[in-house]
């Protein structure tokens, strides 16, 4: 049997059953999530659920830039350090940079400091690039 790999929307990249879109536009976290959702197909700010997924994403983004942090779909909606993925995925894989999680920083970004392999918390109203994800 020939198994066809699902195709992603133009400009999105495919990895292990998911499509990813890297937006080099500045949005706060909630506006970024709304823009992801506007693409349908269950798109959200990206969940990153394994080192392999993190490495693939980091390698892709490094082909575009190496200095700007990027919003992902991890947030702390109750502001109690109870982090969760906006797409409902289980919060098992973690890749925090080790920076302080205090203050009013309840949204997560991929940090450029470690080639996008680790995350930092940041204030959700900051305008940054963002990464969307959906399953085709």
């Amino acid at each position: 049997d020939i198994i066809m790999r699902p195709s992603c929307a133009p400009g999105w990249f495919y990895h292990k059953s998911n499509c990813y879109g890297y937006f080099r536009k500045l949005r706060n976290w909630s506006d970024a999530e709304l823009e992801c959702q506007s693409y349908g197909n269950g798109a959200h700010l990206a969940s990153i659920l394994s080192l392999k997924e993190a490495s693939t994403i980091a390698e892709y983004i490094s082909g575009y830039q190496r200095s700007q942090p990027i919003w992902i779909g991890l947030h702390d909606p109750q502001k109690r350090q109870q982090w969760q993925w906006i797409d409902g995925a289980m919060y098992l894989y973690r890749s925090w940079s080790g920076k302080s999680m205090g203050g009013n920083k309840h949204c997560a970004e991929m940090s450029s400091n470690n080639n996008f392999l680790t995350w930092s918390s940041n204030e959700c109203n900051k305008r940054q690039h963002f990464l969307c994800k959906y399953r085709p």
């Epitope: 400009g11 937006f23 080099r24 536009k25 082909g63 830039q65």
Partner: antibody
Framework: EVQLVQSGAEVKKPGASVKVSCKAS????????INWVRQAPGQGLEWMGW????????NYAQKLQGRVTMTTDTSTSTAYMELRSLRSDDTAVYYC?????????????WGRGTLVTVSS | FMLTQPHSVSESPGKTVTISCTAS????????VQWYQQRPGSAPTIVIQ?????PSGVPDRFSGSIDRSSNSASLTISGLKAEDEGDYYC?????????FGGGTKLTVL
């Protein structure tokens, strides 16, 4: 007031090199990249490359790789663009334009342009 | 990728004109689109940045938009004036490269 002041017109022979300068004032030089854009007579805008005065990173248009070098001198807030092995089709107005580092939102101030004529 | 613009457009004073800018591949919404005006003999100036934002000093007759379905950006100029005549260029990004459209000559009849 932000200003980008470019050097004067140049006439060069084929095979020669030209170095155009762009002196910036009115803002923090290292906070903005400098792009170089050229426009041949009667033609559109062609992006040549970009340099960051902050860390000296450069990106050049593939078409010009190997012939162009962009540099900056932070002590004088001046950017330079050198183009080597000139050909007649390099005849153009050369513009410098600033772009906020990491912004991806375009070129908000431009120099007035430097006409480079390549003729034997 | 490439950004394709119509070679020329013309319209009468007071009317509205729209100039399109179509991306040949990828997703135009991934990057900001800018628009530049160039009057004869002058350097370009930015009239729209970040898809639809007017820099200070640009009249509100100028507006920008993105149409994801056609993978294109548009510049709309309403209440056309003679001073709007000139060349208009869209600009966006592809990885580390900055990309310009081929330019559109606007003639105000």
């Amino acid at each position: 007031e932000v200003q980008l002041v470019q050097s004067g017109a140049e006439v060069k022979k084929p095979g020669a090199s030209v170095k155009v300068s762009c002196k910036a004032s009115g803002y923090t030089f290292t906070s903005y990249g400098i792009n170089w854009v050229r426009q041949a007579p009667g033609q559109g805008l062609e992006w040549m490359g970009w340099i960051s005065p902050y860390n000296y990173n450069t990106n050049y248009a593939q078409k010009l790789q190997g012939r162009v070098t962009m540099t900056t001198d932070t002590s004088t807030s001046t950017a330079y663009m050198e183009l080597r092995s000139l050909r007649s089709d390099d005849t153009a107005v050369y513009y410098c334009a600033r772009e906020e580092t990491g912004s991806y939102h375009g070129f908000d101030y431009w120099g007035r342009g430097t006409l480079v004529t390549v003729s034997s | 990728f490439m950004l394709t613009q119509p070679h020329s457009v013309s319209e009468s004073p007071g009317k509205t004109v729209t100039i399109s800018c179509t991306a040949s591949s990828g997703n135009i919404a991934f990057n900001y689109v800018q628009w530049y005006q160039q009057r004869p003999g002058s350097a370009p100036t930015i009239v729209i940045q970040e898809d639809n934002q007017r820099p200070s000093g640009v009249p509100d007759r100028f507006s920008g938009s993105i149409d994801r379905s056609s993978n294109s950006a548009s510049l709309t100029i309403s209440g056309l004036k003679a001073e709007d005549e000139g060349d208009y260029y869209c600009q966006s990004y592809d990885k580390y490269y900055r990309i310009f459209g081929g330019g559109t000559k606007l003639t105000v009849l």
